[in-house]
């Protein structure tokens, strides 16, 4: 009898107790494989769910979430409220990310900014609630002949660029040396 059941196609159910064993699934039910003993009730996409694919006698309905919500779980089993970028969903609703954290999506939690110094790099662009920090090249990458894998960033904030710091330090040293020699030269003139 089991072999007879396997002849029942998807869209039907099988009953070994009858001579004619295959029966069509009733409305709003389905069987996605052959030989099933019962038809499953179609999923209904109601409330925060909306129908992505209608149910048929051989496949279940598929749901999405209405605007302002996103799917969670296998086969969109739950809908969770969207938040803005720079926020995370808490039990009390959407809350801004704390300083030092960011979220660039409408879902999920706020994550800590990347710690550039752990990779021996410097901060090229500061982080925000919506965006992670951008790490720049390490000071070692600036030595002559060294090639940097990090492309130059289009925007650099003064005080954060190692190139500028290096340039200012060099300029200061040269100016100090010039002043030193000027002072010495002035003293020599006075002695004469």
């Amino acid at each position: 009898l089991q072999d007879l059941c396997s002849n029942c196609p998807a869209g039907t159910f099988c009953d070994n107790n009858r001579s004619q064993i295959c029966s069509p699934c009733p409305p709003n039910s389905f069987s996605s494989a052959g030989g099933q003993r019962t038809c499953d009730i179609c999923r209904q996409c109601k409330g925060v769910f909306k129908t992505r694919k209608e149910c048929s006698s051989t496949s279940n309905a598929e749901c999405d979430c209405i605007s302002g919500y996103h799917c969670l779980g296998a086969e969109c089993s739950m809908c969770e409220q969207d938040c803005k970028q720079g926020q995370e969903l808490t039990k009390k609703g959407c809350k801004d990310c704390c300083f030092g954290t960011f979220n660039d999506q409408k879902r999920g939690i706020c994550r800590p900014w990347t710690n550039c110094s752990l990779d021996g790099k410097s901060v090229l662009v500061n982080g925000t609630k919506e965006r992670d920090v951008v790490c720049g090249p390490s000071p070692a990458d600036l030595s002559p002949g060294a090639s940097s894998a990090t492309p130059p960033a289009p925007a650099r904030e003064p005080g954060h660029s190692p190139q500028i710091i290096f340039f200012l330090a060099l300029t200061s040293t040269v100016v100090l040396f010039l002043l030193f020699f000027l002072v010495l030269d002035y003293k020599d003139d006075d002695d004469k």
Partner: antibody, heavy 114, light 107 residues
């Protein structure tokens, strides 16, 4: 919305042949089994044939077995009923319906008469 | 084959009256019975499936009940637009079979 539109009916002589079609739209045709059901003038409904979604399973009423052939073209969303050796008792309105038997077409009338 | 017997063959009712239509199966068909409404020159429309489930968009004055061999369609307060033939059918086993129908007429 779900729509089923039958065509191909008309006047046929006894012993003749005819092919009915049912054009489906508004649902995923390839995921549904389909039925043909007929209704003789001033009579009740009589189930004629069933074909599963993938054409692997076919059933016929005893009254049409060996004379009628049900088939489908999922690429064209169309159901067919090829009828041969027609008799006067085959005169009826022929309806196609999804296997849930929830939606029916408007029907196509077949008259078998000399 | 399972035989579905409907009674009465026809009935005349006044608007607002309660209508009860009967359908008996020659053998146990579980709850695999549907009721259809067919207006003159139109195709059948599904009202009730699974003996008691109202199909989408069907007014709640239509109620189905019963199981095994005895089934009933009740119209709690008949309206003028309910003038039609009513068919019961079983999908418990092939061949699917239908009753001869009950014609509902208005007085």
């Amino acid at each position: 919305q779900v729509q089923l539109q039958e065509s191909g009916g008309g006047l046929v002589k006894p012993g003749g042949s005819r092919k009915l079609s049912c054009a489906a739209s508004g649902f995923t045709f390839s995921e549904f089994g389909m039925h043909w059901v007929r209704q003789a003038p001033d009579k009740g409904l009589e189930w004629v044939a069933y074909i599963s979604s993938g054409s692997s399973t076919i059933y016929y009423a005893d009254t049409v077995k060996g004379r009628f052939t049900i088939s489908r073209d999922n690429a064209k969303n169309t159901l067919f009923l090829q009828m041969t050796s027609l008799r006067s008792e085959d005169t009826a309105m022929y309806y196609c319906a999804r296997d849930w038997v929830d939606y029916w077409g408007q029907g196509t009338a077949l008259t078998v008469s000399s | 084959n399972i035989v579905m017997t409907q009674s009465p063959k026809s009935m005349s009712m006044s608007v607002g009256e309660r209508v009860t239509l009967s359908c008996k199966a020659s053998e146990n068909v579980g709850s695999y019975v549907s009721w259809y409404q067919q207006k003159p020159e139109k195709s059948p429309k599904l009202l009730i499936y699974g003996a008691s489930n109202r199909y989408t968009g069907v007014p709640d004055r239509f109620t189905g009940s019963g199981s095994a061999t005895d089934f009933t369609l009740t119209i709690s307060s008949v309206q003028a637009e309910d003038l039609a033939d009513y068919h019961c059918g079983q999908s418990y086993s092939y061949p699917l079979t239908f009753g001869a129908g009950t014609k509902l007429e208005l007085k």
